[in-house]
Each structure stands twice: as structure tokens, then as C-alpha cells.
Amino acid sequence: AQNITARIGEPLVLKCKGAPKKPPQRLEWKLNTGRTEAWKVLSPQGGGPWDSVARVLPNGSLFLPAVGIQDEGIFRCQAMNRNGKETKSNYRVRVYQIPGKPEIVDSASELTAGVPNKVGTCVSEGSYPAGTLSWHLDGKPLVPNEKGVSVKEQTRRHPETGLFTLQSELMVTPARGGDPRPTFSCSFSPGLPRHRALRTAPIQPRVWEPVPLEEVQLVVEPEGGAVAPGGTVTLTCEVPAQPSPQIHWMKDGVPLPLPPSPVLILPEIGPQDQGTYSCVATHSSHGPQESRAVSISIIEPGEEGPTAGSVGGSGLGTLALA
């Protein structure tokens, strides 16, 4: 059978080979399509409700005024010329519809490096057969399930027209230190060959690089945190991040009721100041970060200062913030 591809809604003419060019003609068309059960016979005399779908023209050709999805199938003509020679024509008709240009909806303007992000949803409406959607990064195809790329697809069929709507949601995990303005696009590839792909307008989200969280350093003077009664201890919270975060202080796991400051001075140390101290840096972009804890202890004259003193009383004594 000869393969014929016809666009939905367009007319189609199928030639009946060997048919006399004008009546009287001995020919018959048989069709087996979505509109028929087994074979439907159409003759040149025809003329009837089937004319809305297919009718035999005076030259013996079969004319379909507006091809529909239900017209996919087999069309056969059997004709006899004036000399009694029989000729058969056999066609396999497939139909197609090109959708409108695909679009990317719900697109992200900003992506975060190192974590999965939804880039957007590509939508194609009105195709037949369904066809496929694919994503591109900087013009190169993106392969799902590779290098942090995942795609969620959905296909719906219109209950009346039978045409397809395709949706494809793209998730990516941009690499740190990669392209700060990647270009994403989506293309629709028709289900029938010989039809070029349709591509969306590109989108260019910014990639935001979160500053790597460097450790919050707590420096204590004197080193080791052991001090004679009445001495002074200085705790300094060092945070490399910019802009400078807010620094709060903790003692024995409880926040100290003090205004934010990167330096905590404990003058005239007494037993009530002994304990475990840490600082907490709060960044606007990624929450609080706590330093290691250090122990502050009192040593009597002549004692060796321990690196980690035991926890003492809970009194605050006198605190000074630089």
C-alpha cells in the first residue's frame, strides 16, 4: 500500500489508477477507517451522507473534503478500463496535526546551584499523533536522569477533537561554579516523520551560588579558657561570610540575654562564670550556624590550666561586650 500523510482539516484526493477519465466508469472505492466497520463501499453513483467524508469525483478519484482522525486507515480502488483490464490502487492514510508553538510556563527566574530546581513546564497543545517534548541546555539536548536532570511528563487527549496536549516539567541541579546564565529551551518533535521540530523561545534564569558555609571559629583568650579568679576572658566569634551575620552567645546551651556582638568579654571572673560557651552566627540566606563550644574554668594559683574545665555555677557575674 502507498503511504499517504494528510493534515487534519485539509482536503485529500486519492487517485484511482486505471479508471476511465470520465463516466461511464466501472470502479468502486472501499475504505476501512475509524468511521467504518470492516469495509465501506463507495461508488461513483454514491451521493449521500458519506459525501461529508469522502465522495467519488467524476474522474474516479476519491475526494475527502476535510480529513479527520477517524479517516486514518486503508483506502482501495478497483477500476476496470474500457478494455476490461482491472487495476487496483491501495493507500494507507495517516493523519497529523502540527500543534501551536510550544511554550514554557511557570519558568524560574533564579536557580540555586547545588540543589534541585524547577526550571519550568513546557506545554504543547493540539498535536496528532502525540509527538514528544524535549529540553535543551545551551542548544544541546538534556538527557533525563543524567547529571541532576529530571523530567516529569503528562499527555492528555481532548475528548472532542482527539488532539493531544503534552506537558513536560524540567528539574535541574546546577553545578557550583557553572554558567551563571544558562539558556534553556524546549522543542516539540512530531510523531510523524518529515516534519521539523518546533522550539520555544529560550529562557535564561540566573544561577545563584550560595556562599559555602565556612565554619564559625570561636577564639578564646587566654588559650584553653582556664583563668585565675578575678582574671579576664575574651571570646571572639570569627565568621568569614559577607555580609557579616548577627552573632549571639550561648552558655551551657542557653542563649545569653545580650545584644548581638562578635566579641564577649568576661571581666573579673568568678565561679558563676564557669561553663561552656559557644556563639551562633545567623545569616539572612541560610539560617543559624553554631561554633564549637569552649569551657571556661577557674584555676587556683599554682594549678595547671586544663584545656577543658569542668562546668561551674550558673551565675553570669559581670559581662562586657566589645
Epitope: 451522507p49 461529508s52 467524508v53
Partner: antibody, heavy 119, light 107 residues
Framework: EVQLVESGGGLVQPGGSLRLSCAAS????????MTWVRQAPGKGLEWVAS????????YYPDSVKDRFTISRDNAKNSLYLQMNSLRAEDTAVYYC????????????WGQGTLVTVSS | DIQMTQSPSSLSASVGDRVTITCRAS??????VNWFQQKPGKAPRRLIY???NLADGVPSRFSGSRSGTDFTLTISSLQPEDFATYYC?????????FGGGTKVEIK
């Protein structure tokens, strides 16, 4: 909402003529075949004529062929039935209906107009 | 021309009854048969299209079936508003042919 409104019926003498009209609204008129169906008093339904959406092809049963002519004006969303050489047996309510083809056969009907052929 | 032989021509039934009306085509008409309901003084209303499909707005107690050239309209539980005349229509070929009608009356 699809609406079909017939007009032009009335009393006519045998051998006379009458022209029925059908005004269509609520759908894209030139996309559809149109049909006239009639019903004699106390009788069943009988197909009278059909026309394709372009108006190029018309179809009739033998009982009215050569006497009745179906036509349409797509610009005016109107369907017509020109009835000549009327006979007593043409007395009926005439309905205009959308469709009559394989794709869409008579889902919508007008309320009908009565044609009486009598001397 | 195709003949559509409809039976019975009339029937009496009660509310709640199951009612079956049949049309037999004189030759193969595929699935191209519709069923209509008509009440006195009103235009016909399409109930079933292409043998088995329920038209929009038609109650689900109506159904259509086909076996070869035999077409059946079934009302599963007759309601008071269903007392009317029912017609089948063949539209596979011209002339379009209606069945003779079945009048459903109250018993």
C-alpha cells in the same frame, strides 16, 4: 445555544408554490450540512432534502425531486426550501434540522412550520 | 433504498417498566442509526447517535445497542415524561430513512 427558526408556511393551492426559510444561530452555520424533514398530520417523519455546508451538493428523495429545491445563504445563516407543483400529500409540518451527514446527523431541530396544500 | 422496520408500532407500559424498541435495517448500515423522541406538537429530540452513544442531556436510563442490522432502544425504567413516540433514523445512505415510529402509552 443552537437555534433554528422556520418561517414561510401557510395555506397554498395544489400546483402552487411556497418558499420556506430557516434562520440559524448559535453555531458556525457554514460548517454544517442542513436538512429539511417533514411530518404529515398523524404520520411519521420523512426526509425531504439535504445540502452540504458549501451549498454545492444537494440531495432529495424521489418523492420531491424536481419539485423542491434546497438552498442556503451562508452569509445570512439561512436555509431555504423552494416548493413548486405542490400536492395535497405535501401537507405537513416542515422541520429544519442541522446535519444529515455521516458526521452530524440531526442533533438540532427547529419547531417546524405548517404547510397546508388544499383547494 | 434502505427500509427501516420498527417494532412494535405501539406499546402500553407502566412507570418503572423496562421498555425495548427495535429497528431492523434491510441492509447493512454500519453504526449509522440515531434514535429520536417526539412529544405531541413538539420537534423530535435526538436521544442516541451512532447506534450506541447517549446524546448530551439525555438521562442514562436510555441506551442503544446494535447487533448486525438490528438496532435497539432500551428505556431501563420508564418515567412519566417518557410517554412519547420514538423513531429510528438510518443515515448511512440517501434517502435518509426513518422507522415508522413506536408510540409508548400509559397502561
Amino acid at each position: 445555544e443552537v437555534q433554528l427558526v422556520e418561517s414561510g408556511g401557510g395555506l397554498v393551492q395544489p400546483g402552487g408554490s411556497l418558499r420556506l426559510s430557516c434562520a440559524a444561530s448559535g453555531f458556525t452555520f457554514n460548517n454544517y450540512w442542513m436538512t429539511w424533514v417533514r411530518q404529515a398530520p398523524g404520520k411519521g417523519l420523512e426526509w425531504v432534502a439535504s445540502i452540504d455546508n458549501s451549498g454545492d451538493n444537494t440531495y432529495y428523495p424521489d418523492s420531491v425531486k424536481d419539485r423542491f429545491t434546497i438552498s442556503r445563504d451562508n452569509a445570512k445563516n439561512s436555509l431555504y426550501l423552494q416548493m413548486n407543483s405542490l400536492r395535497a400529500e405535501d401537507t405537513a409540518v416542515y422541520y429544519c434540522a442541522r446535519g444529515g451527514d455521516i458526521l452530524d446527523s440531526l442533533p438540532y431541530w427547529g419547531q417546524g412550520t405548517l404547510v397546508t396544500v388544499s383547494s | 433504498d434502505i427500509q427501516m422496520t420498527q417494532s412494535p408500532s405501539s406499546l402500553s407500559a407502566s412507570v418503572g417498566d423496562r421498555v425495548t424498541i427495535t429497528c431492523r435495517a434491510s441492509q447493512d448500515v454500519g453504526i449509522y442509526v440515531n434514535w429520536f423522541q417526539q412529544k405531541p406538537g413538539k420537534a423530535p429530540r435526538r436521544l442516541i447517535y451512532r447506534a450506541t452513544n447517549l446524546a448530551d442531556g439525555v438521562p442514562s436510563r436510555f441506551s442503544g445497542s446494535r447487533s448486525g442490522t438490528d438496532f435497539t432502544l432500551t428505556i431501563s425504567s420508564l418515567q412519566p415524561e417518557d410517554f412519547a413516540t420514538y423513531y429510528c433514523l438510518e443515515f448511512d445512505e440517501h434517502p435518509l430513512t426513518f422507522g415508522g415510529g413506536t408510540k409508548v402509552e400509559i397502561k
